[in-house]
């Protein structure tokens, strides 16, 4: 069951991300930022299942890209970062297989380009913030908390999709 696999993978990714913290977040309170997470894209009601999966895929892909940069490698403990990236990569493979499976079952698998664009813009804001803050430890700490929050949303969307099965 791919959705179940993804949900478990997401939980593992969240635990790894939680373990990756290197500095006290309480020293970074002033650095917090509203990145405008596109929550409406994750409410899971207005989508076909294929569309929801494609939004989840974009979310994981962008997270993978963010944590695959050189700046990210310098910020995090290497073995945890590798485990986290591997977990995300596995989820991407699972979701791609899931899309293929769903496309065969749904009559009109429309691509929800607006939703995907909203996710990309969200990550652009995160990247811009990191650049502005010169990839400081506090900037990365703020981003880590933000990604944990957004991964939690995608886990919840996954649960709702599973209930629809």
């Amino acid at each position: 069951d791919l959705p179940q696999t993804h949900s478990l993978g997401n939980r593992r990714a969240l635990i790894l991300l939680a373990q990756m913290g290197r500095i006290s977040p309480f020293s970074c309170l002033k650095d917090r930022r509203d990145f405008g997470f596109p929550q409406e894209e994750f409410d899971g009601n207005q989508f076909q299942k294929t569309q929801a999966i494609s939004v989840l895929h974009e979310m994981i892909q962008q997270t993978f890209n963010l944590f695959s940069t050189e700046d990210s490698s310098a910020a995090w403990e290497q073995s945890l970062l590798e485990k986290f990236s591997t977990e995300l990569y596995q989820q991407l493979n699972n979701l791609e297989a899931c899309v293929i499976q769903e496309v065969g079952m749904e009559e009109t698998p429309l691509m929800n380009e607006d939703s995907i664009l909203a996710v990309r813009k969200y990550f652009q804001r995160i990247t811009l913030y990191l650049t502005e803050k010169k990839y400081s430890p506090c900037a990365w700490e703020v981003v880590r908390a933000e990604i944990m929050r957004s991964l939690s949303f995608s886990t919840n969307l996954q649960k709702r999709l599973r209930r629809k099965d």
């Epitope: 969240l14 939680a18 002033k30 509203d34 405008g36």
Partner: antibody, heavy 120, light 111 residues
């Protein structure tokens, strides 16, 4: 379901120390910050401090820095708070509460509270 | 420390009417898009319950008659229409900087 089970009522003498516990269940104990909050009878709430069970990292309200010590034992899924040099001012209900929404620092689940009474 | 001043200290509201509780911070608790102010409800003999986070976000499972607003230093909790079960003490809490502090509470009585 998430539960925070706190130790029972404590009666202590002035000058003594007490250690209360908060056993967590229903979630990944090591990946959520745990706050401690004080409430004196008929009064408001005071934030004491917070601990991250995953690595033992703590942050205190300066007011309680020399009064409270927060620890956690991950194998037992339990957080502890020790209060030292007790005075009548320390008579209160103490809550452990789970941090919520990551760096928004709100509190979703609360223990039932440990009542500490300091009396000679 | 940021001091949160709640007003009124107590109020009595008729069933079905609006209850408005104010929380004023001695310093801004808003930064870069978020207002780090939250609201809790505590009924006698019970633990506090989170109602609103980040000034205006309704916590899951909380009835829509509860709403929060404000930014910077001035925040408001509204309850409309008030129901019997809303009789409780309401606290604001900020997480703008250390130490986090709570307001002194507002006791709501239903007439």
């Amino acid at each position: 379901q998430v539960q925070l089970q706190e130790s029972g009522t404590v009666l202590a003498r002035p000058g003594a120390s007490v250690k209360m516990s908060c056993k967590a269940s229903g979630y990944s104990f090591t990946t959520y910050w745990m706050h401690w909050v004080k409430q004196r009878p008929g009064q408001g709430l005071e934030w004491i401090g917070v601990i991250y069970p995953g690595n033992g990292d703590t942050t205190y309200n300066q007011k309680f820095k020399d009064k409270a010590k927060l620890t956690a034992v991950t194998s037992a899924n339990t957080a502890y708070m020790e209060l030292s040099s007790l005075t009548n001012e320390d008579s209160a209900v103490y809550f452990c509460t789970r941090n919520y929404k990551y760096d928004y620092y709100t509190m979703d689940y609360w223990g039932q509270g440990t009542t500490v009474t300091v009396s000679s | 420390d940021i001091v949160l001043t709640q007003s009124p200290a107590s109020l009595a509201v008729s069933l079905g009417q609006r209850a408005t509780i104010s929380c004023r911070a001695s310093k801004s608790v808003s930064t870069s898009g978020h207002s780090y102010m939250h609201w809790y409800q505590q009924k006698p003999g019970q633990t506090p319950k989170l109602l609103i986070y980040l000034a205006s976000n309704l916590e899951s499972g909380v009835p829509a008659r509860f709403s929060g607003s404000g930014s910077g230093t001035d925040f408001t909790l509204n309850i409309h229409p008030v129901e019997e079960e809303d009789a409780a003490t309401y606290y604001c809490q900020h997480s703008g900087e250390l130490p986090f502090t709570f307001g002194s509470g507002t006791k709501l009585e239903i007439k």
